[in-house]
């Protein structure tokens, strides 16, 4: 029959061409002399001559070497004519199919990749993705299936297991609890995309994971003890700058601290506000403090931070005591 | 023995036609390309084009489609090329050579002995 | 268009020297080459075809090598009958074009 099944022909073949595919035949050969020939892209249209076909034989012939990802498959036309060059049967569909061959290594979309993810977060938070193209076929074979590893982590605190990516998507995730800001701020991860599913060419990109701060840490008092020393009558007079340290990232609402006097200012005598770069505690007197009423306040003031704690925390206290100074007032008649 | 015949010199005038032949024997004419090659005097060698006489089929260099008109006699075994609207340009000696199909990529392995064109006035 | 280059343009050699011609395409043709002889006043005859299979009669002296852009003809030992031009041809999909040969002349 007039009739051709779909011819595959490995990509990359090594010759020698012309390479004999497959023979035309009509069997209108009987009756009269016939001679074959092929149109079509790969023919006799760009890409030309990838195809031809031995006239009088019908022997169709691949001329070079294919390249799948180029071009995957062909569609070529079959014609036979008798001698004195009238078409003896329709032209007939021949379809070319370029197998695959593992000839393309995969390839990161990027050299580096970035992320991020809280401190402290449970095991199996998503932290990024990392993706790998093949070129090959990842369809019909696994040539062009891209499997996902991590080769190595930096720094390996609080050990190298930190972090794992899915075999298949790359989506990378915490796998294990201890992530801290304070003492890893960022890990390396050298990250591998193989393709074979695994078993073939590999490739390595850096996926680096940014520790954003949790407010794990409370500030703190460093003293938790002032002595201080106000003239009485003073309104707005600044009495004691309070210090605290706070281990979460500077500048941030989980290190940025709020004060508040718990106990000692039963008259309302006192306010505290907190310096926008120091971060102290700035105790000033809201009203004049009378010596001959009381010469000695003490109070009791308790920091927190201007965001919430991501975990129960002591809350860090400290003490000033006010010393109210004498001064010589005008008698009152 | 294979063998390519060639006819003999022409002198043509400017602005007419000629017709030179190629007559082959000892092969299967039908089944060979037949290819058509320029030689200008004291110059390199310009495929013209081919034919197949089995079925007729031509293919030509861009350069010569509408100078040069490749056919071919099978009862005969003898191919022709017509040139058309000569002029100096197309002084030259045409040669003829085979090539076989099988392999479909084969190269000239027997030529004619040429063909001198001269145009002039 | 394919373009084929061929270098030396002419080339003067001795009875018994070795030379070599090279070609070169301006796309890959894979081992789709041919070298011819011509002879002054005579027609080209094959020597080398398929890169470098010797066309039937052609002496062992004549050698063909290359692939893909970059051909070259080799003949060992030359003889006074070994003078002429010499052409590189594609045989690989129509049109055919040839180099522009080269003039091998006896020193």
């Known amino acids: 029959d007039w009739v051709v099944a779909p011819i595959s022909v490995p990509e990359n073949g090594k010759g020698p061409f012309p390479q004999r595919l497959n023979q035309l035949k009509s069997n209108k050969d009987r009756d009269t002399k016939i001679f074959y020939s092929i149109t079509g892209p790969g023919a006799d249209s760009p890409p030309e001559g990838v195809f031809a076909v031995e006239k009088e034989t019908g022997w169709l012939l691949l001329n070079k070497p294919l390249d799948r990802e180029e071009i995957a498959k062909y569609e070529l036309f079959g014609h036979a004519v008798s001698e004195n060059g009238a078409s003896v049967e329709d032209p007939m569909n021949i379809s070319i199919i370029v197998t695959d061959q593992n000839d393309h290594k995969p390839k990161f979309t990027q050299d580096t990749f970035r992320g991020s993810v809280l401190e402290g977060v449970m095991p199996g938070t998503s932290v990024m993705q990392v993706t790998a193209t093949d070129e090959d076929d990842a369809v019909n074979t696994y040539n062009g299936v891209v499997a996902y590893s991590i080769h190595s982590q930096e720094p390996k605190e609080p050990h190298d297991l930190m972090f794992t990516i899915h075999k298949s998507t790359g989506t990378i995730s915490v796998i294990s609890s201890g992530l801290d800001r304070e003492k890893v701020p960022e890990y390396r991860l050298t990250v591998q995309a193989t393709d074979m599913d695994g078993e073939g060419s590999t490739t390595t990109a850096e996926a680096v994971v940014q520790i954003l701060d949790a407010n794990d840490n409370a500030p703190e008092f460093d003293p938790q003890k002032y002595e201080a020393h106000v003239p009485e009558n003073a309104v707005g007079h600044e009495v004691q700058r309070l210090t605290v340290t706070d281990l979460d990232a500077p500048n941030s609402p989980a290190w940025r601290a709020t004060y508040l006097i718990m106990g000692g200012d039963d008259g309302d005598h006192f306010t505290i506000t907190t310096h926008p770069e120091s971060n102290q505690g700035i105790l000033t007197t809201r009203k004049g403090l009378d010596f001959e009423a009381k010469n000695q306040h003490t109070l009791y003031v308790e920091v927190t931070n201007e965001a919430p704690f991501v975990l129960k925390l002591p809350t860090s206290t400290a003490t000033i005591v006010v010393h109210v100074e004498d001064v010589n007032e005008a008698p009152v008649f | 023995v294979q063998l390519v015949e060639q006819s003999g010199a022409e002198l043509v005038k400017p602005g007419a036609s000629v017709k030179i032949s190629c007559k082959a024997s000892?092969?299967?004419?039908?089944?060979?390309?037949m290819n058509w090659v320029k030689q200008r005097p004291g110059k390199g060698l310009e495929w013209i084009g081919r034919i197949y006489p089995g079925d007729g089929e031509t293919k030509y260099n861009g350069k010569f489609k509408g100078k040069a008109t490749l056919t071919a006699d099978k009862s005969s075994s003898t191919a022709y090329m017509q040139l058309s609207s000569l002029t100096s340009e197309d002084s030259a000696v045409y040669f003829c050579a085979r090539q076989r199909d099988y392999g479909a990529l084969y190269a000239l392995d027997y030529w004619g002995q040429g063909t001198r064109v001269t145009v002039s006035s | 268009e394919l373009m084929m280059t061929q270098t030396p343009a002419s080339l003067s050699a001795s009875v018994g020297e070795t030379v070599t011609f090279t070609c070169r395409a301006s796309?890959?043709?894979?081992?789709?080459l041919a070298w011819y002889q011509q002879k002054q006043g005579k027609s080209p005859q094959l020597l080398v075809y398929?890169?470098?299979t010797l066309a039937e009669g052609v002496p062992s002296r004549f050698s063909g090598s290359g692939s893909g852009t970059q051909f070259s003809l080799k003949i060992n030992s030359l003889q006074p009958e070994d003078f002429g031009s010499y052409y590189c041809?594609?045989?690989?999909?129509?049109?055919?074009?040839f180099g522009g040969g080269t003039k091998l002349e006896i020193k």
């Open positions: 041809q594609h045989h690989y999909v129509p049109p055919y074009t």
């Open positions: 398929n890169a470098k």
């Open positions: 000892g092969y299967a004419f039908s089944t060979s390309w």
């Open positions: 796309e890959n043709i894979y081992s789709y």
